[in-house]
Amino acid sequence: LVPHLGDREKRDSVCPQGKYIHPQNNSICCTKCHKGTYLYNDCPGPGQDTDCRECESGSFTASENHLRHCLSCSKCRKEMGQVEISSCTVDRDTVCGCRKNQYRHYWSENLFQCFNCSLCLNGTVHLSCQEKQNTVCTCHAGFFLRENECVSCSNCKKSLECTKLCLPQIENVKGTEDSGTT
């Protein structure tokens, strides 16, 4: 199957790479603008320069283009705990990330929130915290995993999943009590 091309893609495909078809005269191929610039005026004729202007502060283009306006720079979402990794330049958007010992949790394709990595207190790190994934913990004997934290088996109620994990501990306590009464 041939992918469906949009009007602009159809027009561009007529011209060699790095050029685009003049919107008013389809016999003219104009040179695209470099990244960091935008199209101010189309080239007046074949072999003549396209009028490209540098993006103003707060805007960018990251690839060669024939956009009439530069794109607005993204802002890092402070309410999501995001920090600026690198500032916006004329040819690159702002890069946002998380602080050290935090991971990104994505709510949508482009929206992420920063959370602290679990520390695995009373346990060991099974899988280290990664850019987009929290630490995976395993717990020491006498502790069970609840909400990715190691909780003492003394907090294990019979109805919870932890009864399986804490069973040896419970048995040991029971055994000690039994041996003490004989």
Epitope: H105, Y106, W107, S108, E109, F115, R146, N148
Partner: nanobody, 116 residues
């Protein structure tokens, strides 16, 4: 299979209250931060509030701060959103969200209409 089922929406007058619930299944609920997002008619998705996996930490969009309260009951695999002092601009379909990926999907949402 991940399932998120929102409920509790409805028609309410400005200044009124509603409590939304989201019943989760198909994943280990207590290990995941959860969020409420909303989509007003003809608009894009807007993040409303987040709660950490333990429920200790909560986060709110400026537009709802002081009016909405997010909470969770990990023993019941349920997420809640208490909405007070509702305004016309809170009218939207409300979704509870887990983690975005190409496989997970959100529930069908619950419609909240604030109108006199």
């Amino acid at each position: 299979e991940v399932q998120l089922l929102e409920s509790g929406g409805g028609l309410v007058q400005p200044g009124g209250s509603l409590r939304l619930s989201c019943a989760a299944s198909g994943f280990t609920f207590g290990y995941e931060p959860m969020a409420w997002v909303r989509q007003a008619p003809g608009k894009g998705l807007e993040w409303v509030s987040t709660i950490s996996h333990t429920g200790r930490d909560t986060y709110y969009a400026d537009s709802v701060k002081g009016r909405f309260t997010i909470s969770r009951d990990n023993s019941k695999n349920t997420l809640y959103l208490q909405m007070n002092s509702l305004r016309a601009e809170d009218t939207a379909v409300y979704y509870c969200a887990k983690r975005w990926s190409s496989f997970d999907y959100w529930g069908q949402g619950t419609l909240v209409t604030v109108s006199s």
